[in-house]
């Protein structure tokens, strides 16, 4: 084993090539220098290197930077990121969006990893706030990625940031956090006209509350039963028969389908059976005719 | 689309010589290690050779080590086999394969031909 | 490094669940894929780094595994399924293949 820890002879690497790749293990131990292999990282990309020798490549990079590497050379990891822990990446300082671009790329057609989900964190840490750019590259790799952030770091995301957001970045997010992006979506598209703000504004709107629904019912904006479906029940309960129906329009029979699942069916129980009538699509469940409705919540208010 | 179409397979004598030609298209070639796998009918697979993108660097299974011969041409998008002093042992079909490092970071293959038999028999 | 899959045949039903082992002679790490040979046909990649799927291949195949006790498994077999399966090895040069497993039907 001793004579194994000297290069044997004319076998010194000069450059990161494609000759090394039948090196045994200890021969990329013994031959390559780790400053050759910094400065030549981007080269590794192209060298089909097993596991073994990854793990050799990376051993040699951390006894060079102990403390975390560079960015020049993390920009240029390709696929020894694939080898990286969340403790080594937890080391870096990453500033740059073309190194993140360059490590999820990497990552492509993966879930996301630990070490993916670390190396976002330590970015968006680095910044102070998910801006617009970045948002747009997470989402681009992991259009789940907003959704998989709490509704404290949402907090953090600028209203301007929320033109990257596409309606499938949205579709795994609870109401809690939409009840965060919403209002930074009617900050965002506040200026543009009616048909074009609801379009943009149509897949925050589980986070909307009664009185922009109500406001929305006076638009003709014809929304569809999906959007309805994803309401926050306690926004809908409010509305009206003759509301529900102008924030539908010609999706107003889609209800009857829906009767039974909420919000749909929790609203069908808080209006008078005739108003409900008048829709003429056969739903049932509503107060009957005669009955007084005792708005509890606003007695407790006024006492 | 990806497509490796090999030829060239055959009946030969136990001694002789046969070169394998594969084609390769819907890819850039160049940018991918290329690899020559047999398997002996009703046996598993073996990977019987190895080359580069730029075809400077070369691997050779013991078996067939001073007498085959992988070589290609990335202006063709070709990868050949040169075969030589064949034994009846040599009698299998020989898939080319390509390297998937390039596309997923990791030394396996991810496309493949459908295999030339080359049948070693006197 | 040698890959040793067991068993070398089985013989199982539409429908069952299927599970074929591959065992390396030293440790991996997760350096592991799996192809599919059906008769006459060039292998198909199936999953690599032990348990990523390929894109295209149907959900019920999985794989598991690290170090040296690997495990390819179809949850509920299909008749296309029914075929040669193969485990590779791609931590350290020459790159190996076990010997096969044969999924024949009962």
């Known amino acids: 084993e001793v004579e194994k820890t000297a290069c044997p002879s004319g076998k010194k690497a000069r450059e990161i090539d494609e000759s090394l790749i039948f090196y045994k293990k200890w021969e990329l131990e013994a031959c390559v220098d780790a400053a050759l292999l910094a400065t030549q990282m981007d080269r590794v990309n192209a060298i089909p290197f097993t596991y073994e020798q990854l793990d050799v490549l990376k051993h040699k990079l951390d006894e060079l930077y102990p403390q975390g590497y560079p960015e020049s050379v993390i920009q240029h990891l390709g696929y020894l990121f694939l080898k990286m822990s969340p403790e080594d990446i937890r080391k870096w300082n990453v500033t740059s969006l073309e190194t993140l671009k360059a490590l999820l790329e990497v990552n492509k057609g993966h879930e996301m990893s630990p070490q993916v989900a670390t190396l976002i964190d330590r970015f968006v840490k680095g910044r102070g706030q998910l801006d617009k750019d970045t948002l747009d590259t997470l989402t681009a790799f992991y259009p789940g990625y907003l959704c998989s952030l709490s509704p404290e770091e949402l907090s953090s995301v600028p209203p301007s940031s929320i033109w990257a957001v596409r309606p499938q970045d949205l579709d795994t997010c609870d109401p809690r956090q939409l009840d965060v992006l919403y209002p930074k979506a009617r900050l965002a598209f506040q200026n543009m006209n009616g048909s074009e703000y609801f379009v943009k504004i149509q897949s925050f709107l589980g986070g909307a509350p009664t009185e922009d629904l109500k406001a929305l019912s006076q638009q003709n904006v014809s929304m569809d039963l999906a959007t309805f479906m994803k309401l926050r029940t306690d926004a809908v309960l409010p509305l009206t028969v003759a509301e529900v129906q102008k924030l539908l329009g010609p999706h107003v029979e889609g209800l009857k389908a829906e009767e039974r699942h909420r919000p749909v069916r929790d609203w069908i129980l808080r209006q008078r059976q005739d108003d409900l009538d008048t829709l003429g699509l056969g739903l049932q469940g509503g107060i009957p005719n005669g009955y007084l409705v005792l708005d509890l919540s606003m007695q407790e208010a006024l006492s | 689309q990806v497509q490796l179409v090999e030829s060239g397979g055959g009946l030969v004598k136990p001694g002789g010589s046969l070169r394998l030609s594969c084609a390769a298209s819907?890819?850039?070639?160049?940018?991918?290690?290329m690899s020559w796998i047999r398997q002996a009918p009703g046996k598993g697979l073996e990977w019987v050779s190895y080359?580069?993108?730029?075809?400077?660097?070369?691997y050779y299974a013991d078996s067939v080590k001073g007498r085959f011969t992988i070589s290609r041409d990335n202006a063709k998008n070709s990868l050949y086999l040169q075969m030589n002093s064949l034994r009846a042992e040599d009698t299998a079909v020989y898939y080319c394969?390509?390297?998937?490092?390039?596309?997923?970071?990791?030394?396996?293959?991810?496309?493949w031909g459908q295999g030339t038999m080359v049948t070693v028999s006197s | 490094i040698q890959l040793t899959q067991s068993p070398s045949s089985l013989s199982a039903s539409v429908g069952d669940r299927v599970t074929i082992t591959c065992r390396a002679s030293?440790?991996?790490?997760?350096?592991l894929a799996w192809y599919q040979q059906k008769p006459g046909k060039a292998p198909k990649l199936l999953i690599y780094?032990?348990?990523s799927l390929e894109s295209g291949v149907p959900s019920r195949f999985s794989g598991s595994g690290s170090g040296t006790d690997f495990t390819l498994t179809i949850s509920s077999l299909q008749p296309e399924d029914f075929a040669t399966y193969y485990c590779q090895q791609f931590n350290s040069y020459p790159l190996t293949f076990g010997g096969g497993t044969k999924v024949e039907i009962k």
């Open positions: 030293q440790g991996i790490s997760s350096a």
């Open positions: 780094d032990a348990s």
């Open positions: 080359i580069s993108s730029s075809g400077s660097t070369i």
């Open positions: 819907g890819f850039t070639f160049s940018d991918y290690y």
């Open positions: 394969a390509r390297d998937g490092y390039r596309k997923y970071g990791y030394v396996f293959f991810d496309i």
